[in-house]
Amino acid sequence: GITIPRNPGCPNSEDKNFPRTVMVNLNIHNRNTNTNPKRSSDYYNRSTSPWNLHRNEDPERYPSVIWEAKCRHLGCINADGNVDYHMNSVPIQQEILVLRREPPHCPNSFRLEKILVSVGCTCVTPIVHHVA
Amino acid sequence: GITIPRNPGCPNSEDKNFPRTVMVNLNIHNRNTNTNPKRSSDYYNRSTSPWNLHRNEDPERYPSVIWEAKCRHLGCINADGNVDYHMNSVPIQQEILVLRREPPHCPNSFRLEKILVSVGCTCVTPIVHHVA
């Protein structure tokens, strides 16, 4: 990895568990304006492996709202607009970081948590197991 | 939203910008074991809109390594294994939270940042613009 010289103007950490516990500014720097995935594109409808987006809310988590994709079909949509079960719609999953309130119900104390979310679906060729 | 009663055992916040600046425990609670997306599934190879994963490293960011998907083709793979340009491979993107060191090079001070990452690709029917 790349080593970085420490900035002499850094805040001091008086925490015994340093560097495990850090200060985080929640004033988000957002390079993108779209937050609702339904508005960002219509791929979920136009895909050969279309999906629906489900709202997952948890007030003990930051962000409290996460959108989860669920594939509409087990198969994929063919050129005639029908479901072809010789192909499979599968979820594309990604591990993301969220902040979990710890201790619970505390407004200013969090712990990092990794969760797996389904972002959308893709159409794949099935793995065929041949029986000897 | 849902209102939560405050836990009386919460740490005190002496920061003037509270609740903007919070304490975060970086000892990640991880519900998942796979971290390398190439190991988690082979969908990126079996998809009709296959993709490659590129490593994006930034030591000023946490996590410092993020994997970015690039679709291998502009079209999609048809039943014969050829690229069909009547369909489009498109990236499925997701906004994720990362921690950005602020001030720069500080080990214990961060700011939340939202970035857009490509997680994988899906095959979509193109939008055809008819000229009058």
Partner: nanobody, 113 residues
Framework: QVQLVQSGGGLVQPGGSLRLSCAAS????????MAWYRQAPGKERELVAG???????DYGYSVKGRFTISRDDAKNTLFLQMNDLKPEDTAVYYC???????WGQGTLVTVSS
């Protein structure tokens, strides 16, 4: 098929400047996110700079404040303005359709006194 044709590059002294260009055919610059990557000898290809269709830019850690990505939709061309060049910027630079494995032919930039 999309073609990306690069120009610019060459030998420059430390502290100097260079501008790379990337012309696309057909017209894709305005409708696709674009990026510049580079690959130094014996290293992985790394993101230098990206620009979205809405003009939002992002930069690799080591070039922030020195490099600027821009595009001219009318000329269907992507640019990379490189200032205050350092020896560690020496690499082959590639223009890229950001979310696709579509690349320019590569341009060598050498920073040396």
């Amino acid at each position: 098929q999309v073609q990306l044709v690069q120009s610019g590059g060459g030998l420059v002294q430390p502290g100097g400047s260079l501008r790379l260009s990337c012309a696309a055919s057909p017209r894709v610059i305005s409708i696709h996110d674009m990026a510049w990557y580079r690959q130094a000898p014996g290293k992985e290809r790394e993101l230098v700079a990206g620009i979205t269709t809405r003009g939002i830019t992002d930069y690799g850690y080591s070039v922030k404040g020195r490099f600027t990505i821009s595009r001219d939709d009318a000329k269907n061309t992507l640019f990379l303005q490189m200032n205050d060049l350092k020896p560690e910027d020496t690499a082959v630079y590639y223009c890229n359709l950001r979310h696709y494995e579509v690349w320019g032919q590569g341009t060598l930039v050498t920073v040396s006194s």
